[in-house]
């Protein structure tokens, strides 16, 4: 059987507002006083098994003791009333759980949304944490009828149990209640149709147009409560590889529609589209985005001709020369489609023009030593580009006019070239470059620049610490001008090895040192200067600096009959590298000298 407690704590279910004071009393039963030979002065209060200081306790009379707590902050405290029976044995009389928290704030920012095909969901901001069990109830009514209450599970939202009725205003509010108080939000009044979030448009399809390479036609299916709502659309698109979306102006898609033509697109480009919808009045919520759909604009004729150049191979006989016509494949943005082939036309004055159809990017022809005009056009399935025209002069004609002040310099991991144009109008410029090496031939790459350009960077994949020979040729209507060349590095490094020094001539007090230039493959940069370090086995080291144009140097004021150790280093802008050490001995006597 349950034992009757010896007394009680009041209140039995204490809930306190945080930061306030709270007093509890423990009342002992008369039978208890007699049985244990105690009174209220024997009561010991404990919170979470720790004794409460005496100064917080007041003995009201022989049966009753009170305890007062100021500025309560702990969320939950076990408060027990205990007696010292027979003056020493502590016995529990009663215990309660004291909770602390706050009354509910007035809920704010109450909003409702009708997700198409679902019941209405309302959300609100409950305000500060109450730390207490708090019930939030969503209330709703028409002017004449109340709807079932919606008990919130999470305290911030609730989905009503009834289907919304459209085109009739509804009043909605939230009531919040806990042990410390009850409060209602402001009510909101609206027609549920103005809170609809439609399901995303679906079956989005994209088709191109053979007539216009700059458009794509979109079509889709909208729901809009099964046609009950008129929806306007929001269309966004991007190229397949882009990460940012381009917005179709919303004013273009304001009227209800299920198709749209997007304009001003690039030819033969894959675009990705997405679409969302909202009630045409703009009230309610945008749907989620549709599934993405992609389409490719139709091809258009290439927008410009390829870069076009030629190289003449040394002729075997006197009558003919082998000419290699070369061109660059157009980038996709200019090809506007799949390039099927290139058309090269060779013409001469009062002669039958000759047309070659080539699938690659070069054509070698045997030409006479007369002047030719070559034209080049790229072709896709829509048509041909404009023609690039090159005059190939007779090899007996000396090229006049070159660029001046040709410079090259690295910047931002690119190798830049700049020049001053020649004094005659230029059609274009050709830049050629290759890696200078003693171990491999100079395999040229090239690029074309417009006549207006006089500063550009090399567009190939360049390597660091390699010496590039760069040539710039202006091209005129009458043919190429003179070529100007220079050497440059994308990035210099210290040489891979230093010079190997030797003696050319050794005298009693001087020695002529000689060395070979470091091979270009090992230079790793422009050799700016050399240092020569020399010493005897006991003397201190001497250093002389020599200009990079020299390949020999005379050491003077040497001691006779002495062993010298010599080492040479070569320096680029990025550092130096020592060559191997070399020793020589000066003779005891000069030539013809006797002891």
């Amino acid at each position: 059987q349950l034992l009757e407690p010896c007394g009680y704590i009041y209140p039995e279910f204490p809930v306190v507002q945080r930061g306030s004071n709270f007093t509890a009393i423990c009342v002992l039963k008369e039978a208890c006083l007699q049985h244990y030979y105690v009174n209220a002065s024997y009561i010991v209060w404990k919170t979470n098994h720790a004794a409460v200081p005496r100064e917080q306790v007041t003995v009201i009379n022989r049966t009753t003791s009170s305890v007062t707590f100021t500025d309560v902050v702990l969320p939950s405290v076990q408060l027990t009333c205990n007696i010292l029976s027979f003056g020493q044995i502590e016995q529990n009389v009663y215990g309660v759980t004291m909770l602390s928290g706050f009354p509910p704030d007035k809920p704010t920012n109450l909003t409702c949304i009708v997700n198409e095909g679902k019941n209405m969901l309302c959300q609100w901001d409950p305000g500060r944490e109450t730390y207490l069990e708090t019930n939030y109830t969503l209330k709703s009514e028409w002017a004449t009828e109340k709807f079932p209450d919606c008990q919130s599970k999470h305290g911030t939202s609730c989905m009503v149990s009834y289907m919304p009725t459209y085109y009739v205003n509804i009043e909605v509010w939230v009531e919040a209640e806990n042990a410390l108080g009850k409060v209602s939000s402001e009510s909101i009044n609206f027609d549920p149709v103005d809170k609809v979030k439609p399901t995303p448009p679906y079956n989005l399809s994209v088709t191109n147009s053979e007539e216009l390479s700059s458009i794509l036609k979109l079509s889709w299916v909208s729901s809009g409560l099964g046609g009950l709502l008129d929806l306007k659309s929001d269309i966004q698109y991007r190229t397949k590889d882009a990460s940012t979306w381009i917005q179709v102006p919303l004013e273009d898609t304001m009227s209800p529609r299920t198709s749209f033509t997007v304009q001003d697109l690039k030819p033969f480009t894959e675009y990705v589209f997405r679409i969302r919808s909202i009630k045409d009045s703009g009230k309610g919520y945008w749907s989620d985005w549709s599934e993405e759909a992609s389409g490719t604009t139709y091809e258009d004729r290439p927008s410009r001709p390829p870069s076009f150049w030629y190289k003449t191979n040394p002729s075997h006989g006197q009558e003919y020369r082998s000419v290699r016509l070369i061109w660059k494949a157009l980038p996709l943005s200019e090809a506007n489609g799949k390039i099927l082939d290139y058309e090269v036309i060779l013409t001469q004055s009062k002669s039958v023009s000759q047309t070659y159809t080539v699938t690659g990017t070069e054509l070698t022809v045997n030409l006479t030593n007369d002047r030719y005009v070559a034209s080049l056009a790229a072709r896709n399935k829509v048509g041909k580009s404009a023609a690039a025209v090159l005059t190939i002069p007779s090899p007996h004609v000396t090229a006049a006019y070159s660029v001046v002040n040709l410079k090259a310099f690295p910047k931002d991991n690119l190798l830049w070239v700049e020049w001053t144009p020649p004094p005659k109008p230029v059609s274009k410029y050709i830049l050629e470059w290759c890696v200078l090496s003693e171990n491999a031939p100079c395999v040229e790459d090239w690029q074309q620049e417009d006549a207006t350009v006089n500063r550009t960077h090399l567009r190939g994949r360049l390597l660091e610490s390699k010496c590039y020979q760069i040539t710039v040729t202006p091209v005129f209507a009458t043919g190429p001008g003179g070529s100007e060349s220079l050497k440059a590095y994308l990035k210099q490094a210290a040489p891979a090895r230093g010079p190997t020094v030797r003696t050319k001539k050794v005298g009693k007090n001087e020695a002529v040192l000689a060395w070979d230039q470091i091979p270009v493959d090992d230079q790793n940069g422009f050799i700016r200067n050399y240092s020569i370090s020399y010493r005897t086995s006991v003397g201190k080291e001497m250093v002389v600096h020599v200009d990079s144009s020299h390949t020999e140097y005379t050491l003077s004021s040497l001691s006779s009959d002495t062993l010298y150790m010599v080492r040479m280093a070569a320096y680029t802008d990025e550092g130096g590298k020592d060559g191997p050490e070399f020793t020589f001995t000066t003779p005891k006597f000069a030539q013809g000298e006797i002891e």
Epitope: E319, K350, V352, Q354, Y356, V365, N366, T368, D370
Partner: nanobody, 125 residues
Framework: QVQLQESGGGLVQPGGSLRLSCAAS????????MSWVRQAPGKGLEWVSA????????YYADSVKGRFTISRDNAKNTLYLQLNSLKTEDTAMYCC??????????????????WGPGTQVTVSS
């Protein structure tokens, strides 16, 4: 300055023969392939025959194959076309034309023109 002067045309009966000549100047004749073309009244230009710079390779349109013969004399800077077994459909203005390279390649496309005065061949009974 390229100059071409055709001669040797005339009026001939069906089955008859003619020899056309083309005197060239203003360029290195021996370095270039040459062609004969013709234009019948109210028709477009039609290629007839071609010969490479050295004279070793010759080419003919199907309509004249076996009847016409092209030749050249590089020493005299002259191109020839021997017309045999002439038919009424061979009636046309005949012109010679200079190519831009030493070889004629049937796989290439050519844009022909009459730069010289041409010589008229009329086949009629």
């Amino acid at each position: 300055q390229v100059q071409l002067q055709e001669s040797g045309g005339g009026l001939v009966q069906p089955g008859g023969s003619l020899r056309l000549s083309c005197a060239a100047s203003g360029f290195t004749f021996s370095s270039y392939a040459m062609s004969w073309v013709r234009q019948a009244p109210g028709k477009g230009l039609e290629w007839v025959s071609a010969i490479n710079s050295g004279g070793a390779s010759t080419y003919y349109a199907d309509s004249v194959k076996g009847r016409f013969t092209i030749s050249r004399d590089n020493a005299k800077n002259t191109l020839y076309l021997q017309l045999n077994s002439l038919k009424t459909e061979d009636t046309a203005m005949y012109c010679c034309a200079k190519h831009v390279t030493g070889d004629y390649d049937p796989s290439l496309r050519y844009e022909y023109n009459c730069w010289g005065p041409g010589t008229q061949v009329t086949v009629s009974s």
